[in-house]
Amino acid sequence: IWELKKDVYVVELDWYPDAPGEMVVLTCDTPEEDGITWTLDQSSEVLGSGKTLTIQVKEFGDAGQYTCHKGGEVLSHSLLLLHKKEDGIWSTDILKDQKEPKNKTFLRCEAKNYSGRFTCWWLTTISTDLTFSVKSSRGSSDPQGVTCGAATLSAERVRGDNKEYEYSVECQEDSACPAAEESLPIEVMVDAVHKLKYENYTSSFFIRDIIKPDPPKNLQLKPLKNSRQVEVSWEYPDTWSTPHSYFSLTFCVQVQGKSKREKKDRVFTDKTSATVICRKNASISVRAQDRYYSSSWSEWASVPCS
Amino acid sequence: RAVPGGSSPAWTQCQQLSQKLCTLAWSAHPLVGHMDLREEGDEETTNDVPHIQCGDGCDPQGLRDNSQFCLQRIHQGLIFYEKLLGSDIFTGEPSLLPDSPVGQLHASLLGLSQLLQPEGHHWETQQIPSLSPSQPWQRLLLRFKILRSLQAFVAVAARVFAHGAATLSP
């Protein structure tokens, strides 16, 4: 058993069919010695008396908020949560496996630049009685500070018969060094509590591997005289690291017809302009990627040819 | 050429070669199905590689103040990786394919290190760790880790030379 936060305890349950469960001794936080009684959740039924209460925790029904009282006055609370291990594996019932980029991916994170700021998100089908708390650090043996905000519900989607909820959190490395080569990964730890179930999820990554620039901005077309060609120009996204002479992007320019089946023409360039042939009803799209490290491409920025 | 005494390197040549190194490093080891090599307990293998750290002066301001600190660090790393790529980790079994970019990568590391330091001048180089994996699968894993680490290193080096070529060239 360990303390998650004040008056909240996690009982680790290694479960198998005939598992004996965990013996837990709760102590009432009071100088009083006599006349102490214990209750569970909202029930007024007395479970036991005395300064300590011993319980055998074997299933979720044994967890909950245990309260000690004296003469109708509440002395202290202890909320017991269960963290279940089955076949040597901690349960992952609360969050949905996003399966991208690989199986057992519960947390996904992205950064728009090298400033040490990143966003992580996760999915669940649970709508109520759900709380998250997020901690992060750079490295684990001698951790350096990363500050995370509160996790917030960022999107709701309907998937078939189920509703899916997306939560996200923003974190910022306290002493980021954008130009350095990372040698220690960022660790992100999410505590999830649903009713009386506790689970924790972790992700470990280098900022360089989760970089995804915003799409290029100010995408413009300039027709070239007496030609079907146009000059496409764009700018670095505002959120990208500066100076651009140091933090450089490379770009992919695509001409796409109305029909998805039509052949796409693609040009790769390090410049912020390109000359392409504009077909009728086609659109021109541009996306960006770090020039020197193959992390994710940005989403496309698009303009119609007409 | 970057003479240790303090003259400027051929920024544009270094830029071109370092960008080529980036391309080669990624073609030698593309993202292998997002194989997470950090899960494979690599502390003892890739912790010994020289990293371009915060205090090495490789940021834009540090380069403006005195690029020599940074160039020395990059040179150290290039020599280190050049030795690793020439070691039995890469020459032993399983043999690299004949068209593997590792050979070109090895030659380009050497080429860039020579651009930074002409013969006759010596910067301190880092001792290469004695890594001699016995099993072919260990060697394969080590290659992946070294190439992943090299990708990060050459990305920073390429940024340094691109910025130098744009802002510090005579």
């Epitope: 569970l40 039924e45 479970l47 036991g48 319980i55 299933e59 979720f60 029904g61 009713k195 009386l196 | -």
Partner: nanobody, 126 residues
Framework: EVQLVESGGGLVQAGGSLRLSCASS????????RGWFRQAPGKEREFVAA??????TYSDSVKGRFTISRDIAKNTVFLQMNSLKSEDTAVYYC?????????????????????WGQGTQVTVSS
């Protein structure tokens, strides 16, 4: 999934006693509460007793006569029935709830339960 198997039913004289057992298997860690319900011919299934950890609750009609208890080690719940009356004649069902209610009295509602046993017949002859 949770499986529940009742036993101990039978024919008993009015004023006599019976002890019902309900063995649970499967993913029993997910259980929040267990309960006993009964159904007499032509009647609705009604609540008898429930247990969660050390908490117990009873319907007014059996209070003081029936006792629900739990053997943690054996994953079994018992219903000790004393001073039986002819109106206690019914099929007795064991149920398990895997939903959490902070108000324990919610476990006296039939729709709070997710898993049910096949039932055991109790006949009290006068």
């Amino acid at each position: 999934e949770v499986q529940l198997v009742e036993s101990g039913g039978g024919l008993v004289q009015a004023g006599g006693s019976l002890r019902l057992s309900c063995a649970s298997s499967g993913r029993t860690f997910s259980i929040y509460a267990r309960g006993w319900f009964r159904q007499a011919p032509g009647k609705e299934r009604e609540f008898v007793a429930a247990i969660r950890s050390g908490l117990t609750t009873y319907s007014d009609s059996v209070k003081g006569r029936f006792t629900i208890s739990r053997d943690i080690a054996k994953n079994t719940v018992f219903l000790q029935m004393n001073s039986l009356k002819s109106e206690d004649t019914a099929v007795y069902y064991c149920a398990a709830a895997v939903n959490y209610f902070t108000d324990f009295t919610d476990y006296s509602k039939r729709d709070s339960y997710d898993y049910w046993g096949q039932g055991t017949q109790v006949t009290v002859s006068s």
